[in-house]
């Protein structure tokens, strides 16, 4: 019999709107930011089945906003749950001159302010050693279908959700589940969570694949220990 | 339409725990949107928010009362509680249970109360 | 704790008069997360305004909210017979997670 005491499950009901506070902030780089909230006591776990994601609910300039964020933390943390998020500031990009609704109402926010999570969404489920159920729409039941080797393509914070899936494959010894994932960003210091990516190609050679594709290349010489750069992003249009 | 109703006893001795009940008709209390939330006035004063509760049973608290604090729901009643610990005289007042379902989807203010109950601690 | 002070704590007019009540808060309120309440003698409080500026379902257009930041306002165009009772405003977010002023009592002069 398993001995060990279930934890209290924060998303319980998928509809409901639970308020967690922010409990850390980290800044990543000039734009990226690790948001760490707290649950509802130090027991409880996010209850996020790997594949699927949280929506962040807030009133800004007087309408409801929702975003969906995919955290970089999992249920092994108890207490809080992480989100590496960035920031699009007003100002920046010509094309979105008020930038990030959200995302700058997360970064304004204080140490101690809630918002109101929402979850789990999502029509991934990845079930153990290449087990997948995708649902063709969000109310329809999971279609099963087993994979070998999953190929994924993510771009900046598009990162996160291929991390919770690298993360929870790499973590059991028994998931031989091969993975290729191309990871584009703009330019080197731009890569998020590349020490640990690197880190799970170099102990995991004949699993995971990483290869870089950067907008703007470094000058010098390239040094990635497990990890390939491409030339640049226009080798996959 | 809805209504709460508070019921418990209206004295309690000092050192005693304090054990409310609210029943909820016109609606069900399995909502997701719902929270139901406690919120005591002392004689003559203001209000203040002891704690709230969702169906699933996951609970907020003031921290001014987290440690003697306890809310439970009971859905298959339409029911939630309020029990309070370790009571003195500073817990006396009127209790009132009260649903935020929240304007614009989110539950940030109380748009349904109850009348209230008084509890009075006492020897 | 983002604490709430009421001003002033009596307000004392007659029927028909305007009645301005203040809420300030001690840290920054998200304008979206503010609430009136109004509560006569003897009864529950019922919620008038939300979100600092929507009225609750069935409240007079007399009542209105306004503000931002830190600083909010009731406003009673007309007062009437009704309207003498008191008042509180309540902030969502932060620890604990709803605070609520004082309150203003309005009474007839």
């Known amino acids: 019999m398993n001995s060990r005491r279930r934890e209290p499950i924060t998303l319980q009901d998928p509809e409901a709107k639970y308020p967690l506070p922010l409990i850390e902030k980290e800044k990543i780089s000039h734009n990226t930011r690790r948001f760490r909230f707290g649950l509802p006591s130090p027991d409880h776990v996010l209850g996020l089945p790997v594949g699927n994601y949280v929506q962040l609910l807030a009133k800004i300039d007087n309408e409801l906003v929702v975003r969906a964020y995919t955290p970089v933390s999992s249920d092994d943390d108890r207490g809080f749950v992480d989100l590496i998020i960035k920031i699009y500031f007003k100002n920046v990009h010509p094309q979105y001159p008020e930038g990030g609704k959200m995302t700058q109402y997360l970064e304004n926010m204080k140490i101690g302010e809630t918002i109101f999570f929402r979850g789990p969404r999502g029509r991934l489920f990845y079930h153990g050693p290449g087990n997948l159920g995708i649902r063709p729409d969000q109310t329809s039941e999971p279609k099963k279908t087993l994979a070998d080797h999953l190929g994924m393509i993510a771009g900046g914070t598009g990162i996160t959700p291929m991390l919770q899936l690298i993360r929870h494959i790499t973590k059991d010894p028994s998931d031989r589940t091969r993975m290729s994932l191309i990871f584009a960003n703009q330019t080197e210091e731009d890569i998020l969570v590349r020490k640990e990516l690197e880190e799970i190609a170099r102990t995991h050679p004949d699993q995971f694949d990483l290869w870089y594709t950067l907008d703007r290349p470094p000058i010098g010489p390239w040094s990635a220990e497990g990890a390939t750069l491409l030339s640049n992003s226009a080798q996959f249009h | 339409q809805l209504q709460l109703q508070e019921s418990g006893p209206g004295l309690v001795k000092p050192s005693e725990t304090l054990s409310l009940t609210c029943t909820v008709a016109?609606?069900?209390?399995?909502?997701?949107?719902?929270?139901w939330a406690w919120i005591r006035q002392p004689p003559g004063k203001g209000l203040e928010w002891i704690g709230s509760?969702?169906?699933?049973?996951?609970?907020y608290h003031n921290p001014s009362l987290r440690s003697r604090g306890t809310i439970l729901v009971d859905t298959s009643k339409n029911q939630f509680s309020l029990k309070l610990s370790s009571v003195t005289a500073a817990d006396t007042g009127l209790y009132y249970c009260?649903?935020?379902?929240?304007?614009?989807?989110?539950?940030?203010?109380?748009?349904?109360w109850g009348q209230g109950t008084l509890v009075t601690v006492s020897s | 704790e983002n604490v709430l002070t009421q001003s002033p704590g009596t307000l004392s007019l007659s029927p028909g008069e305007r009645a301005t009540l203040s809420c300030r808060a001690s840290?920054?309120?998200?304008?979206?997360?503010l609430a009136w309440y109004q509560q006569k003698s003897g009864q529950a409080p019922r919620l008038l305004i939300y979100?600092?500026?929507s009225r609750a379902t069935g409240i007079p257009d007399r009542f209105s909210g306004s503000g931002s930041g830190t600083d909010f306002t009731l406003t009673i165009s007309r007062l009437e017979p009704e309207d003498f009772a008191v008042y509180y405003c309540?902030?969502?977010?932060?620890?604990?997670?709803?605070?609520f002023g004082p309150g203003t009592k309005v009474d007839i002069k």
């Open positions: 840290q920054r309120v998200n304008s979206n997360y």
């Open positions: 016109g609606d069900s209390i399995s909502r997701s949107n719902y929270y």
């Open positions: 509760i969702i169906h699933t049973g996951t609970t």
């Open positions: 309540q902030q969502y977010g932060g620890s604990p997670l709803f605070t």
């Open positions: 009260a649903r935020h379902s929240g304007h614009d989807q989110l539950p940030l203010d109380f748009d349904n």
């Open positions: 979100g600092a500026s």
